[in-house]
């Protein structure tokens, strides 16, 4: 003998977040008379999604006109789907009863899976700057995606990195997931213009991965190299000494001239020149009045770069009746080369 069956033809339905899910249900008979209800989950804790007879379900619309007695279609549409809507939905036929309707037949259930796009990856670098040859860590985070399968890659200037660790949380079933990855990057002096990119690929992105970037200019500190040279005589009693500060980054730099250990002048780097690799060069000069000195003069160019301990380079200026043009940077003339001065 024929008996009403509740047919849910779709074992599973996959819907993108924000879209509408259609959950199909057909009763194979118009009798017994009684309403249809939709539930998420089974058993005593099941959640009522739609009741044909009563209630207000603002996100749910029926595909067919359920007020018509000859209708066998009890499909519903759920609007504005979010990952929290994931679960198994059951279409349940009730038989008219007194005082309450009695559950008669349930469909096999339709599993609703929600595809949610990952958020834009956020890449963050170390809190403090680091110098070339040091290894620094970058983290990349993306949230709110579903299903769990996701691919994360790291790149530095288009070259894929291999030294990274990635976790997807939670480990078990969830409505949505997060990914966290940490990559290790070795800095080089040429990295001012470099970028670290975190690339996330997910089924919802249709082959167009999301990228998060971090500029190594925010991370790297390239310490300057100093060179002090004595220029040809400008006048009988004056010598021009220059301090060339090369290949530094970032620009924040303060230079102090010392004559025999005494501060002569302090200045801040302003009109710098930029190198192709993004580092800066700067030059400062000191006009020394030789006639004011009886003895030899030790000139020191002391540089404090980006709040780091000062580095310095010295130059010995020989005082004689006729100051000759001196060679630059010879060992004899540059005592205390790169020595740390504490004044």
């Amino acid at each position: 003998e024929e008996e009403l069956q509740v047919i849910q033809p779709d074992k599973s339905v996959l819907v993108a977040a924000g879209e509408t899910a259609t959950l199909r249900c057909t009763a194979t008979s118009l009798i017994p008379v009684g309403p249809i209800q939709w539930f998420r989950g089974a058993g005593p804790g099941r959640e009522l999604i739609y009741n044909q007879k009563e209630g207000h379900f603002p996100r749910v619309t029926t595909v067919s006109d359920l007020t018509k007695r000859n209708n066998m279609d009890f499909s519903i549409r759920i609007g504005n789907i979010t990952p929290a809507d994931a679960g198994t939905y059951y279409c349940v036929k009730f038989r008219k009863g007194s005082p309450d309707d009695v559950e008669f037949k349930s469909g096999a259930g339709t599993e609703l899976s929600v595809r949610a796009k990952p958020s834009a990856p956020v890449v963050s670098g170390p809190a403090a700057r680091a110098t070339p040859q040091h290894t620094v860590s970058f983290t990349c985070e993306s949230h709110g995606f579903s299903p769990r399968d996701i691919t994360l890659k790291w790149f530095k200037n288009g070259n894929e990195l291999s030294d990274f660790q990635t976790n997807v949380d939670p480990v078990g079933e969830s409505v949505s997931y997060s990914i966290h990855s940490t990559a290790k990057v070795v800095l080089t002096r040429e990295d001012v213009h470099s970028q670290v990119i975190c690339e996330v690929a997910h089924v919802t992105l249709q082959g167009d991965p999301l990228r998060g970037t971090a500029n190594l200019s925010e991370t790297i500190r390239v310490p300057p190299t100093l060179e002090v040279t004595q220029q040809p005589v400008r006048a009988e009693n004056q010598v021009n000494v220059t301090c060339q500060v090369r290949k530094f980054y970032p620009q924040r730099l303060q230079l102090t001239w010392l004559e025999n250990g005494n501060v002569s002048r302090t200045e801040t780097a302003s009109t710098v020149t930029e190198n192709k690799d993004g580092t800066y060069n700067w030059m400062s000069w000191l006009l020394v009045n030789v006639s004011a000195h009886r003895d030899d003069v030790k000139l020191t160019c002391q540089v404090e770069h980006d709040g780091q301990p000062a580095v310095s380079k010295s130059h010995d200026l020989k005082v004689s009746a006729h100051p000759k043009e001196q060679g630059s940077n010879t060992a004899a003339e540059n005592t205390g080369s790169n020595e740390r001065n504490i004044y």
Epitope: R24, V63, S64, D65, N70, N71, M72, D73
Partner: antibody, heavy 122, light 107 residues
Framework: QVQLVESGGGVVQPGRSLRLSCAAS????????MAWVRQAPGKGLEWVAQ????????YYADSVKGRFTISRDNSKNTLYLQMNSLRAEDTAVYYC???????????????WGQGTMVTVSS | DIQMTQSPSSLSASVGDRVTITCQAS??????LNWYQQKPGKAPKLLIY???NLETGVPSRFSGSGSGTDFTFTISSLQPEDIATYYC?????????FGGGTKVEIK
């Protein structure tokens, strides 16, 4: 006036395919479920397939399941029946019919086309 | 599937006669039953729906009754234009099924 006109019938060899069309006019096609019903020569009526008003669900007789596909294009007010792997027993006049009630899955048919003959023969 | 048994399979009556056709369902189908008329070479036409409701534009000499498993279709006064085959159809259960038809002729 309300009208359904079938086309696409003809003689076809067993195992081959055929597509029937049904052009609707005189009513809001997109509000009604539509069906195909066939009648073998000298025989009674047999329901073949049905589709919801919006095309979101389809229903088939066991005898055609997996071989026939019902579809509709509401923008063209047209119903289709794609018939594959045809057999001699599919020989019949094919009628398209309108469901009696709007926006439902019911199986009472108030408007019928004139029919199109499909002959499956080698 | 629900079996629909129509009787008689054919009948011959005079103009003005009362004609009765019966339709029996293999199980309870409530009142979800239609009656159709099909004239030779033409498409079926809905006459009665839900066992007893007359379709718009159908002459009142046609009527239907019954519920459960037993149904009756009546032409109160047979007219020459009523020569046709009449089919019952249940739509309580999927798939919808038709009776074998009753061919009505004029004596």
């Amino acid at each position: 006036q309300v009208q359904l006109v079938e086309s696409g019938g003809g003689v076809v060899q067993p195992g081959r395919s055929l597509r029937l069309s049904c052009a609707a006019s005189g009513f809001t096609f997109s509000s009604y479920g539509m069906a195909w019903v066939r009648q073998a020569p000298g025989k009674g009526l047999e329901w073949v397939a049905q589709i919801l008003y919006d095309g979101s669900n389809e229903y088939y007789a066991d005898s055609v399941k997996g071989r026939f596909t019902i579809s509709r294009d509401n923008s063209k007010n047209t119903l289709y029946l794609q018939m594959n792997s045809l057999r001699a027993e599919d020989t019949a006049v094919y009628y398209c019919a309108r469901d009696l009630t709007k926006y439902t899955l019911g199986f009472a048919f108030d408007i019928w086309g004139q029919g199109t003959m499909v002959t499956v023969s080698s | 599937d629900i079996q629909m048994t129509q009787s008689p399979s054919s009948l011959s009556a005079s103009v003005g006669d009362r004609v009765t056709i019966t339709c029996q369902a293999s199980q309870d189908i409530s009142n979800y039953l239609n009656w159709y008329q099909q004239k030779p070479g033409k498409a079926p036409k809905l006459l009665i729906y839900d066992a007893s409701n007359l379709e718009t534009g159908v002459p009142s000499r046609f009527s239907g009754s019954g519920s459960g498993t037993d149904f009756t279709f009546t032409i109160s006064s047979l007219q020459p234009e009523d020569i046709a085959t009449y089919y019952c159809q249940q739509f309580t259960y999927l798939p919808p099924t038709f009776g074998g038809g009753t061919k009505v002729e004029i004596k």
